[in-house]
Amino acid sequence: LRLLDHRALVCSQPGLNCTVKNSTCLDDSWIHPRNLTPSSPKDLQIQLHFAHTQQGDLFPVAHIEWTLQTDASILYLEGAELSVLQLNTNERLCVRFEFLSKLRHHHRRWRFTFSHFVVDPDQEYEVTVHHLPKPIPDGDPNHQSKNFLVPDCEHARMKVTTPCMSSGSLWDPNITVETLEAHQLRVSFTLWNESTHYQILLTSFPHMENHSCFEHMHHIPAPRPEEFHQRSNVTLTLRNLKGCCRHQVQIQPFFSSCLNDCLRHSATVSCPEMPDTPEPIPDYMPLW
């Protein structure tokens, strides 16, 4: 978790002098509770936005927006703590809005935004906005949270972001798989414009079951420049196992930008349809 471009982050707006500070996610009001604390944020909204760094890279960011409730507690509102927790790693990053002037009611509802938390493809985050000071131990909570799921690199808008392109999102192998005679599969896919090797991972399963009955790995050497964007054809020999008929073919590239961690593409061949042939009725009935 990180902030996009650590340039001057702004939270000031007409009628409010405000500064954005790094936060340890442990505000002083936890340790030294105050008697009077503000109410919770209203209408917390999160959207996926896209922002360019100064270097020109494009990153997905969480756009966080919330409003204040129209009650007298804004007189005691000293700022806000924004927290983003990545759920699969428990990594947390916080920033603090520090109000340098007192808030006053005005003709419009106070609204705040922040769009500098960089998020990763296919990750889920808990986004929390805490009004400061935080409540006393038994006080009503004054925060709002939402769990936010970021689309993966298959998503059309995500595909062109720097982290997705680095993992090979622009490569479309257009995999085709056909079953040949004599227990063979023919796999065909389009090579990318990089001289790097590929791996085909074949996993076979029985019909309607999820434990594999056959696994095979096939190495494809790095293509020459004149082979870039051409189709590569590989014939794989299957184990002659009756019922081991559903095949998943996965292609793993090893691009220089992502090495062992590139996006994989897969295709599946289903088991052949079994014709519903009725049991043959014998011409005669045996008597024994």
């Epitope: 799921l149 689309p151 993966d152 059309a156 808008r157």
Partner: nanobody, 126 residues
């Protein structure tokens, strides 16, 4: 202009099933998370179920969990809600709703919903 048109509602007996459909147009359907929300007579809007852009994630309100199933067909720009074991308390106007922004939030909207004040009426009564 975002268009969301629901269909499939009707009068049904308790314990029976219905399948709601929502035809969408006016936006890139496959980019957005979608939801079903409902409004019972004299009540406020209640979130029912949500589905992420690629159907990789589905969530349900506790009141419908195990009975309702949300699905989508990005090729047909359509959203569905399969409702089984219907109860009298499921009687409501059902709306399909599009997330205003990209991304998906568990248990409701991340930002505001786009939906049309049309809906399809489901009445569960014996």
């Amino acid at each position: 202009e975002v268009q969301l048109v629901e269909s499939g509602g009707g009068l049904v007996q308790p314990g029976r099933s219905l399948r709601l459909s929502c035809a969408a147009s006016g936006f890139t359907f496959a980019d957005y998370a979608l939801h079903w929300v409902r409004q019972a007579p004299g009540k406020g809007l209640e979130w029912v179920s949500g589905i992420s852009w690629n159907a990789g994630r589905k969530d349900y309100a506790d009141t419908v969990k195990g009975r309702f199933t949300i699905s989508r067909d990005n090729a047909k720009n359509s959203l569905y809600l399969q409702m089984n074991s219907l109860r009298a308390e499921d009687t409501a106007l059902y709306y399909c709703a599009k997330e205003k922004g990209l991304g998906y939030c568990r248990g409701g909207s991340c930002s505001y919903f786009d939906y049309r004040v049309q809906g399809t009426l489901v009445t569960v009564s014996s």
